[in-house]
Amino acid sequence: VPPGEDSKDVAAPHRQPLTSSERIDKQIRYILDGISALRKETCNKSNMCESSKEALAENNLNLPKMAEKDGCFQSGFNEETCLVKIITGLLEFEVYLEYLQNRFESSEEQARAVQMSTKVLIQFLQKKAKNLDAITTPDPTTNASLLTKLQAQNQWLQDMTTHLILRSFKEFLQSSLRALRQM
């Protein structure tokens, strides 16, 4: 059960309710564990993890990435800018996580868990950011057409896209986790 779900607190006797910071930290680590499992299946069934042709597929993707200007790195850290970037980035990743559904055979449930846990994480972060400026949500129409486009790719590109999404999401979450620990 993901840390964000109510049964977590009920299931553990004498467990205090998780604090907001602890919920966020545990949620990210839970998602990262899920990504590791998905990457294992991806790397086992194709040679994408060793491929040098990633640039070809990356041209079709606009995956969220942490940049210096986002204020999430130690140099140039800005907690408010960074928190907005984390939430915006996670919202942008949602379409890619939707794409990952049905991309896994033995880890289908894990892919669903990563998707659902990310939604919960976004909710936690939005609570933390309640005093910050409004966060822009991706346009549903744009997301729908992107999803269609990704699903229409040939098999090799779909495998490569899956690998790139998982790798990018892992990197994004790791950067987010480091930054959020200061907040």
Epitope: D25, N131, R178, Q182
Partner: antibody
Framework: EVQLVESGGGLVQPGGSLRLSCAAS????????MHWVRQAPGKGLEWVAK????????YYSDTVTGRFTFSLDTSKSTAYLQMNSLRAEDTAVYYC????????????WGQGTLVTVSS | DIQLTQSPSSLSASVGDRVTITCSAS?????MYWYQQKPGKAPKLLIY???NLASGVPSRFSGSGSGTDFTLTISSLQPEDFATYYC?????????FGQGTKVEIK
């Protein structure tokens, strides 16, 4: 040299106020969360409070909530602990500490400043 | 709040001895840290996130454990290691500390 220097401690009567300062030097202050930890004479360590690098989020122990306020002046690379309604049980050496970037560990500590609450 | 119980509260050992200090948490914790404190001085970080050695800390110090049971080991005690050791946990706020273990010269 990376260091934190606390000041502002002293003798104060119960119910009184005191403001502690923690001046940072030798590192860029802006990305780090800061903490206060105290140690009563001959006793163990007790965490008091944390402030995020830009001051947007503060966290306090139950024993000081509503009485202590943590603030920052990033232009001076200084953290402050405003202590009101002081009690005898607040008597302790107060340490400020820096939180290690990307972790929850407290990696750099000041030498401490003694606060004595007594009539 | 999460309670941390260290054992022993104090111990006597000789230079070269292998020393083990344990820290038991009242419930499972997310992160565990170990600090060394000498009289009149500030605490010094030794171990973070259960087992990572802090910068500048000699490799004779090591940390292990998970869940509720954690251990600090000094593989070969040196004269400068006589001090009080504290475990500290973070699983949300507040951070809490163990009561300390004083390592004295036998």
């Amino acid at each position: 040299e990376v260091q934190l220097v606390e000041s502002g401690g002293g003798l104060v009567q119960p119910g009184g106020s005191l403001r502690l300062s923690c001046a940072a030097s030798g590192f860029t202050f802006s990305p780090f969360a800061m903490h206060w930890v105290r140690q009563a004479p001959g006793k163990g360590l007790e965490w008091v409070a944390k402030i995020s690098p830009g001051g947007s989020w503060t966290y306090y122990s139950d024993t000081v909530t509503g009485r202590f306020t943590f603030s920052l002046d990033t232009s001076k690379s200084t953290a402050y602990l405003q202590m009101n309604s002081l009690r005898a049980e607040d008597t302790a050496v107060y340490y400020c500490a820096r939180q290690l970037w990307g972790y929850y560990a407290l990696d750099i500590w000041g030498q401490g400043t003694l606060v004595t609450v007594s009539s | 709040d999460i309670q941390l119980t260290q054992s022993p509260s104090s111990l006597s050992a000789s230079v070269g001895d292998r020393v083990t200090i344990t820290c038991s948490a009242s419930i499972s914790v997310s992160y565990m840290y170990w600090y060394q404190q000498k009289p009149g001085k500030a605490p010094k970080l030794l171990i973070y996130d259960m087992s990572n050695l802090a910068s500048g800390v000699p490799s004779r110090f090591s940390g292990s454990g998970s869940g509720t049971d954690f251990t600090l080991t000094i593989s070969s005690l040196q004269p400068e290691d006589f001090a009080t050791y504290y475990c500290m946990q973070w699983s949300g706020y507040p951070y809490t500390f163990g009561q300390g273990t004083k390592v004295e010269i036998k």
